[in-house]
Structure formats: C-alpha cells, structure tokens
C-alpha cells in the first residue's frame, strides 16, 4: 500500500497548482496586454510623431503655400499626396501656370521660391496634360536652357536632355542667341517648343514634386 | 472603415477572446484538479485519483488501479 | 515598422494565441469528458460520474453518490 497523502498536503498541492495555473493566466494576460498596448500606444506615438512631422512639413511649406489640397494615396490612411491649392496635379507632380510676364531667370527664381522649378517635360502624356491649362495666344517658359549657346540644352533639375523626348516645333531651335525654351501654339503644328531670348518676359509653368504627408 | 481601423477592431476582439479563453482554460484546469482530489477522497482510496504529469502543458485524466 | 504593419503582426500573434488556446481548451474538455466516462465504468456504478450542466459555458466536475 502506498502511504496515504494527508488531506492538508492535498490541499497544499491544490493551492500550489492553482497558484501556478493562475500565475500562467496572469502572465499570459499580461503578455496579451503588452502586445495590445504596444499595438495601441506605439501607433498613437507613431501617429503623433507622424502628425508632428506632418505639421512641421506643412509649416515648412506654409510660407509660400498657405493651403494644400490633399488626396489619399492608395488604401493607406496615412499617405496623403498634396499640391498647393491653386496648383494642378498630374501623376507625382504639381503644376502652376504663372501668368506674370518675367524673364527666364526670374521665372525660375520665382518657381524656386515656391519650392518648385520651371517645368521639366519628360513624356508626351505630361505635355498633353500641361497644354490643357494653357492659352493658345501665350508663350510659357520651360525649364530648358542652353546658357552657353552651344546647343547643349539642359533641364533646370539636371534631368538629362533626351533628344528623343523633345517636342520642338519644326525648324526649332534655330538661333544660338535664343538660349531659353518656351512652349507655344502654332496653328500648323499645335503645341510645341521654341527657343527664344532668355531676357524676354514670358509667362511660365512651375513644377514640383507632390508633397507627401 | 479604413483598413487600419478594421485591423484595430480585430485586435481588440482577438485580445478579449484571448483573455476570456485564458481565464476559462485556467478555471477548467483547476476544476479538473479539484475534481480529481474530490474523487480520490470520496472513493475511500479505491483509486489513487488523477495523476498529474507536470511536464505537459495540459493534464491527462488517468485512472489507475492502486497496487494491491 | 509602419503603423499598419505593426497592427497586422499583432493580429497574427493574437490569432495564433487564440487558436492554440482554443485547441488546448477543447482538448482538456474532451479529456475531462473521457475521464468522467472511464471513471464511471471502472467504479462499477458506485458513482454516477461527471454530471454536465449544459447551460454553463464551462463544465464543473461533480461526484454524486448514486441513489441507493
């Protein structure tokens, strides 16, 4: 016969067992709580820091863009792409048609004050979008120039000049003294580029990357 | 509802489910142990009761004939 | 890690925890049920075994002396 366990020993064993089980339960719940807290607090901190970042980003832009128009990018609530309110958006850029008549250098400076550059046209689709907002009887500076007058055209943002993606009017460029490019309308060829003197005041088109907040 | 909000709602549901199930599991485990002890006492020693194997995360109920 | 990614990871952890605990709980419950039946058979009717009260979400192990 196995010696019988005393009732108090059994009670003690049960008590220890209960303690162990409830300890496990508490630890499990604590771990769950930690996880849950992390998922709630961290995102809030994340959101908070993101909001702070957003606000500072907005403050950065506020000096020259008092209001932004933002749209949600994709499904993610946090990714907003914004353009300054009077600007138009296309793909990942914002565009602004400046109706003030200024020289090429002044136009570029004017764009850069707004955090932009004179427009760099990379595709036919982009040009097609831009011309929708232009007036046929006006000319607009592009971010394209040949300061040396040696036909080494260069874009203001250092994008390589690709001869295959240019939209010059026929016979243009045609003058080594005309070192800045405009986009204008010719009834025979519709919209295209022309070289003109940089000091001649023209309207202009500014382009900037969308602001992601 | 946006995707992230949905995720947090699911988090809360799973969290509550986890807590409730943890409590139920622990309660059941203790009841099993208590029942085993009660069973031992009431059967006047005919059976040794439930044997506990601590190395397992769960408990197996096992009746053995005591050595005669 | 981004905010949503963190939420999805936590979802996965809670989901796995819920599944594991559900399985353990069910297993324990089945073992309790089996043990009750075994206990009843082995005691040659001395005890009625475990009585189940279906209205409860959990099961209470209870030995009752059969009516004499």
């Amino acid at each position: 016969m196995v010696p019988e366990e005393e009732p108090q020993d059994r009670e003690k064993g049960l008590w220890w067992f209960q303690l162990k089980v409830w300890s496990m339960a508490v630890v499990s719940i604590l771990l769950l709580s930690v996880c849950f807290t992390v998922s709630s607090v961290v995102p809030h901190n994340f959101m908070y820091s993101k909001t702070v970042k957003r606000l500072s980003k907005l403050r950065e832009y506020q000096q020259y863009h008092p209001s932004l128009t933002c749209v949600m990018e994709g499904k993610d609530i946090e990714d907003w792409s914004c353009c300054p309110t009077p600007w138009t958006s296309f793909q990942s850029s914002c565009y602004f048609i400046s109706t003030g008549m200024q020289s090429w250098t002044k136009s570029q400076k004017n764009c850069s004050v707004m955090g932009a550059d004179l427009v760099v046209i990379n595709t036919r689709e982009e040009q097609d979008f831009i011309i929708q907002n232009l007036k046929r009887n006006s000319s607009y500076f592009l971010g394209l120039s040949d300061p040396g007058g040696r036909r080494h055209w260069q874009w203001v943002d250092q994008t390589p000049y690709n001869e295959n993606v240019t939209f010059w009017h026929s016979g243009e460029p045609n003058n080594l003294d005309e070192r800045c490019a405009i986009i204008n309308f010719r009834s025979s060829e519709e919209w295209g580029w022309n070289d003109i003197h940089c000091h001649v005041p023209q309207k202009s088109i500014c382009k900037m990357k969308k602001i992601y907040i | 509802l946006g995707e992230p909000q949905l995720c947090y709602i699911l988090d809360a549901i799973l969290f509550l489910y986890g807590i409730v199930l943890t409590l139920l599991y622990c309660r059941l485990k203790i009841q099993v142990r208590k029942a085993a002890i009660t069973s031992y006492e009431k059967s006047d020693g005919v059976y040794t009761g439930l044997s506990t194997r601590n190395q397992e995360t769960y408990e197996t109920l096992k009746h053995e004939k005591p050595p005669q | 890690l981004g905010e949503p990614q963190l939420c999805y990871i936590l979802d996965a952890i809670l989901f796995l925890y819920g599944i594991v605990l559900t399985l353990l709980y069910c297993r324990l419950k089945i073992q309790v049920r089996k043990a009750a039946i075994t206990s009843y058979e082995k005691s040659d009717g001395v005890y009625t075994g475990l009585s189940t009260r279906n209205q409860e979400t959990y099961e209470t192990l209870k030995h009752e002396k059969p009516p004499q």
């Epitope: 020289s103 250098t105 003197h197 000091h199 | - | -």
Partner: antibody, heavy 121, light 111 residues
Framework: EVQLVESGGGLVKPGGSLRLSCAAS????????MSWVRQAPGKGLEWVST????????YYPDSVKGRFTISRDNAKNSLYLQMNSLRAEDTAVYYC??????????????WGQGTTVTVSS | DIVLTQSPASLAVSPGQRATITCRAS??????????MHWYQQKPGQPPKLLIY???NLESGVPARFSGSGSETDFTLTINPVEAEDTANYFC?????????FGGGTKVEIK
Amino acid sequence: EVQLVESGGGLVKPGGSLRLSCAASGFTFSSYGMSWVRQAPGKGLEWVSTISSGDSYTYYPDSVKGRFTISRDNAKNSLYLQMNSLRAEDTAVYYCARQIYYDYAYYFDFWGQGTTVTVSS
Amino acid sequence: DIVLTQSPASLAVSPGQRATITCRASESVSFRTSHLMHWYQQKPGQPPKLLIYGASNLESGVPARFSGSGSETDFTLTINPVEAEDTANYFCQQSIEDPPTFGGGTKVEIK
C-alpha cells in the same frame, strides 16, 4: 574691323518725327541682335529699343513705347529707329550697339559714334 | 525694372593707386554660376567701350589692370594701378531681364 555708323539725327520740333539709321560692317549683321541706347546731355545711358537677329522680337521701355519703332534690313546691313511724336526729353545722343549674348543675358560689345537728336521749339 | 546704383558718383585717384567702384542692383542679377553684370568705360566725346562682361571676364584688348568681381546684387570694378588715361565715366549694366538698365555712372579723375 567692326564698324557701326549712325545717321539721321538733327533738330526737330516737339511732336515731329525722325528716322535714324545705323550702317553696320565688318561682321555678319544678320547674326546679331541690335539695340539703340541714348544719352541725354551730361546724363547716364538709357536703353531705347532692341531687335533680335531674326527680326522676331522687338522691345521698348515704357518711355518710348508706341512712339518709336525699331527695324532692320539684313540685306542692307542696316538698323533703323523711327521716332514719332518727339518730346523735349528725347533730346540725346543716340548710339546703335551690337549685342553679344552671355549665358542668359547680353552685353553691348561695339558701339557707334552716335548721332545727336535735339527736340526743341 | 532693376535699378543699378553706383558709388561713389565721382572719384579722384593718384596715378599708381587703386580705384574701386561699386554697383548695387535692386535685385539679384546672378543665376546659379552666371553673374550678369557688365562694365563700360566712356571717355568724353566718345561712345562707351566694353571693359568687363559677366562680372569678372575681361574683354579682349582691355588692360589687365581692370578687374571685376561680385555676385547677386553687389559688384565691384577695380582699376589697379590707375593710369592717367583712365580718366573717364564708368557704367555698370545688367540685362538679365528686359529692360536692360545702366548705373548712373562714376566719374574717375586722376589727380
């Protein structure tokens, strides 16, 4: 040798007209933008008008806009300035100057000797 | 219009000394590395003559004692050493944008 010779100046009554000419030689006239610059007695230099090499662009300051017209005849290597509705303040020595482009701007590398215009009653 | 302000209005220098003339623009006449200010010399009864273009480039045939410097809004013409034949009026000019404008001139006299 580059040479620019102005002519056509003289005395004219207020409201009158004059046509100044500038004969260019020693360079390919049709390849250069040209300007007229004036200097009132004892004063500084004041730009009056510009014409591009291909005749596609002309420009004037507000002080002469609508009254003065710049033109060129590349076949004759000549630059002209038609001045109408002349005023006393138009009295000055008028220089024709050749433009040289430098980066985004230009300067005047050669100047003629000038022709004097006097507007007086 | 861009206003160019020259100083001093007149300057008397001994031969062999340095003469410094400044020209201040009402706004920048530089673009990146291009400084679009030019300097002319005009002797009495003669047309202006180009000395310096692009702020610091010496026109061919101009003596090396003439030099130019500056960027954005502040530019300087230096004559060192001054010679008797340098008696003249000196003008700065910008044409980064139309209308091209000239400074009021600085009269340099040799003592």
